[in-house]
Each structure stands twice: as structure tokens, then as C-alpha cells.
């Protein structure tokens, strides 16, 4: 069932079918005998009760006041009254733009990130049974889509998808043809969720070690889900049996990004492990960033300024 019209202020375009549905509909069915009345007031006119004799364009069904179609002079306040229940709406009917397939003031704006899922479905549940066909237009040019009952676009957004999409439903009522237009202004923007990944700590790290002992080099980064973090060392990774890349640890930050940490474990440090670069790289769609670690014998510490050491 179509949900009730809960918005107190409504703007509609002249010449289109329109309806108001009150929000105590289920209750009204229970109290069939209760008197239910619709009223309109505009300007100097106080509450005027509405009925099909008021206008050939107005129809009343159970919970609904229908306009076939709504016109400029329908602007005003509308009331539904039943026992001690009252609901009020303020209706503003605006002029149709004769030079376009849609009226700018009746456009719903949506922002879609590039490459994210983008969907437009043309459906109108209230008038569904009366709709003969539906067309979807982009910037007022008809799109040729397979389904002419409920035309749909489902895709990953591209910048070229930006524009005004108008769903136009064509329907018959009492031998007359009407149309209802719903327009979306789709703006495609850059992926706002991605950050530039950041390797934490200094870019060059000298680590004081003792021969025969073990060392753990920790590489940490703030990154996106798709970004990768890895160690590069020697001619070909894996040639040194004493070097082990530990499993990456990831923790999600409150902002939805990731704090990643990857440890390189070097066991039984030998001369061949000294004074060579162990590079940790983070790679993203934006590029790469690298920080380097150099193992230095503790005895040689005096040759290097203290501030470049890490533990």
C-alpha cells in the first residue's frame, strides 16, 4: 500500500495527477460509519468542504483525495477531518516549464561518487495500475531502454552519467491521457572516501642491532581498504631463510580507514644483513610511498647522529 502523505508542505507542478492520502487510513477502515470530510481553504475562503461535485477534477476514495489533474488554482490549505482526528497540508501548485521536459523547482538532487553503484528506477506505486508506459529521459532526450513499464539504469557511475534524468509515466483516466514526471539531477563526484595513504614514522630508519640476535622491523601505515603494504629487500624476496614477513595486522579507524602494520622479522642477524636497505612500501591507486630501514652494528652507533636511530 502507498504510504500516507505526511509532509505538511507540498509543491507540485500544474497539469499532473496528484493525490493526498491521510495518515489514519487503517483507523478509518475500522470506523466505516464515522463521518470523514475533506476541506480546502485559500485566501479569503474559509473551510470549504470538498466533494466530487466541487470539481470534475477531484475524486475521493476512502483515504485519498485525488486531482485529475492538479491546477494552479488548487493552491491552498487542505484538511482531512474524522471524529477528533485532523490532518493539514499546505499545497503549492507551480507553473510547468513549457520549454523543458521538467520543471527546475521539482527536481531531486543526488550526488553519486564515480565508480560507485548508480541506479535510477522509474516506478510509481500509487498510479501503477493506470500507467500505460513509462519513458526515461536524460537531459530531455529519450533513452532507449528495454523495459518500457519500469525503465531502469543500474551501473557503476562514470562522469559522463551526470545530468537530469526524467521518469515520465503516461496514464489514462476517464478517457484522458495524463503524464507524471519525476526528475533527478545527478552529479558525479570524485571518490570522496579515499585518503592518500601515509607511512607512519621517519622515511629513513637506522636500527642498532647485535650480530646473532633477532630484530623486528615494524612498518605501519594509515591506508584505504584497497591499498597494499609490503616489504622489499635483497635481489629477490625470500632468498634469505632468516628473514620472515609476518602476517599483516589491520584495524579499522573510526573514520572507516585502516591502520595497517606489517613486521619484517630478521633472525640470527649476520654481516650480510647490515648496511642494506629493507624497504617498506605502501601502494594505492595514487602511487607509492616507501620508508627504509638499515641495520647498523651497535658498536658503530657512535658514527651516526643519535636522532636517526629507531628501536
Amino acid at each position: 500500500a502507498e504510504s500516507c502523505t505526511s509532509r505538511p508542505h507540498i509543491t507540485v507542478v500544474e497539469g499532473e495527477p496528484f493525490y493526498l492520502k491521510h495518515c489514519s487510513c487503517s483507523l478509518a477502515h475500522e470506523i466505516e460509519t464515522t463521518t470523514k470530510s475533506w476541506y480546502k481553504s485559500s485566501g479569503s475562503q474559509e473551510h470549504v468542504e470538498l466533494n466530487p461535485r466541487s470539481s470534475s477534477r477531484i475524486a475521493l476514495h476512502d483515504c485519498v483525495l485525488e486531482f485529475w489533474p492538479v491546477e494552479l488554482n488548487d493552491t491552498g490549505s487542505y484538511f482531512f477531518q474524522m471524529k477528533n482526528y485532523t490532518q493539514k497540508w499546505k499545497l503549492n501548485v507551480i507553473r510547468r516549464n513549457k520549454h523543458s521536459c521538467f520543471t527546475e523547482r521539482q527536481v531531486t538532487s543526488k550526488i553519486v561518487e564515480v565508480k560507485k553503484f548508480f541506479q535510477i528506477t522509474c516506478e510509481n506505486s500509487y498510479y501503477q495500475t493506470l500507467v500505460n508506459s513509462t519513458s526515461l529521459y536524460k537531459n530531455c532526450k529519450k533513452l532507449l531502454l528495454e523495459n518500457n513499464k519500469n525503465p531502469t539504469i543500474k551501473k557503476n557511475a562514470e562522469f559522463e552519467d551526470q545530468g537530469y534524468y526524467s521518469c515520465v509515466h503516461f496514464l489514462h483516466h476517464n478517457g484522458k491521457l495524463f503524464n507524471i514526471t519525476k526528475t533527478f539531477n545527478i552529479t558525479i563526484v570524485e571518490d570522496r572516501s579515499n585518503i592518500v595513504p601515509v607511512l607512519l614514522g621517519p622515511k629513513l630508519n637506522h636500527v642498532a642491532v647485535e650480530l646473532g640476535k633477532n630484530v623486528r622491523l615494524n612498518c605501519s601505515a594509515l591506508l584505504n581498504e584497497e591499498d597494499v603494504i609490503y616489504w622489499m629487500f635483497g635481489e629477490e624476496n625470500g632468498s634469505d631463510p632468516n628473514i620472515h614477513e609476518e602476517k599483516e595486522m589491520r584495524i579499522m579507524t573510526p573514520e572507516g580507514k585502516w591502520h595497517a602494520s606489517k613486521v619484517l622479522r630478521i633472525e640470527n642477524i649476520g654481516e650480510s644483513n647490515l648496511n642494506v636497505l629493507y624497504n617498506c612500501t605502501v601502494a594505492s591507486t595514487g602511487g607509492t610511498d616507501t620508508k627504509s630501514f638499515i641495520l647498523v652494528r651497535k658498536a658503530d652507533m657512535a658514527d651516526i647522529p643519535g636522532h636517526v636511530f629507531t628501536r
Partner: antibody, heavy 115, light 113 residues
Amino acid sequence: QVQLVQSGAEVKKPGASVKVSCKASDYTFTTYGISWVRQAPGQGLEWMGWISAYNGNTNYAQKLQGRVTMTTDTSTSTAYMELRSLRSDDTAVYYCARGWYFDLWGRGTLVTVSS
Amino acid sequence: DIVMTQSPDSLAVSLGERATINCKSSQSVLYSSNNKNYLAWYQQKPGQPPKLLIYWASTRESGVPDRFSGSGSGTDFTLTISSLQAEDVAVYYCQQYYRTPYSFGQGTKLEIK
């Protein structure tokens, strides 16, 4: 329109250098790295290297190390690839491409190395 | 360095029939931290730059017809064209973007039988 526009074809003598430009438009230049890919006549695609537009970090294919330099100018959203000490087997179409899966490509720049 | 190997080198398929191209990487391009495969597929027609078809091994680029699909994980991947059309005649490349140097397969030439 989102695009990468490359500079025109070049004819060079062996030993010379060539600098190809790639101008990005309608997207945030620093969001994506720029890769350079070349294709010799009738051959497959060869990745040459890439540059991070946000920090200028580069990563070059081993075989081109020392001969290639990639740079960017963020003020004009332009990437450059310079190849030095040209040889006849450097004759190829040189493409710039965006990101790490290449969703946007330039039209290509033909560089002919001939004496 | 990761080496990408495609098979077959060339392929002839009748219009409307299924075409399958395989790609094998010398080491896994599956990143265990996010369970993503860092593999893309491209189509290249004569005189044109390559066009991205598939990324993350199976995500179709927007605007690419749904007859193109990608599958596989780790080291073995497949590009499938479910019903070959005349405009699909081209060379197809796989590419890994898991580790630099990023590398392409040697290409598979697809023709109509």
C-alpha cells in the same frame, strides 16, 4: 570530459632524448598515479614505470632505469616522461594511463628512432 | 618480478559462441588482508589505446557489455565473452597491479571463425 591528452608524434636520432607530455583534465590530478606504457610496432604492452601525482615518487621498470625520468607539474595537471639515449628498439607508441588498473588512457604518442 | 602468461596466443570463435582467455601469474596476486585480486583485463583494437574491461579480477568497468566477465583467484584467471560479437575482435591483455613492476600478459588475439 575526463581525458588524458598527449603530445604529438616525434622522430628522433639514436642517442637523442625525447620528452612526452600527458595533460589530465576534469579529475583531481593528485588522486591518481600516472603510468607510462609503451607498445612497439606489432608487439604487446610494456609497463615503463609510474609516478605518484601527489608526492612525485617514482617507480621505474628495471630495464629502463637510468634512461627514463618521469615528472609531474601539478599546477598544469601534466605528467612528463623523458627517455634518453634513444635506440632503434625504443620506436613505439607511448601511452600514459591513470591509476593502478588503467581506467583512462591517452591516445598515444608515436616516437620513431631512426638514423 | 611477477610474470603474466596468457593462453592461447590466438583464438578463433564463431559469432554467438563463448570465448575464453586464460591468464596465469608467476605468483599470487591475491592480497589476503582484503581478499582482493589485483588483476585487470583490457581490450585493444588496431590503432587505439587499450580499454579497461575488468578490474579486481571480476568487477566489470562501467559501460562494458555484460557478456564480458572475469573470474579466478590467486594465480589463475579467466576472461569470458559469453556470446561473441563482431565488434569483440581485438587483442586482449591481462595485467597485475599487485607489485611493481606492474606487468602485462603477452596478449591473446581473438578472431571470428
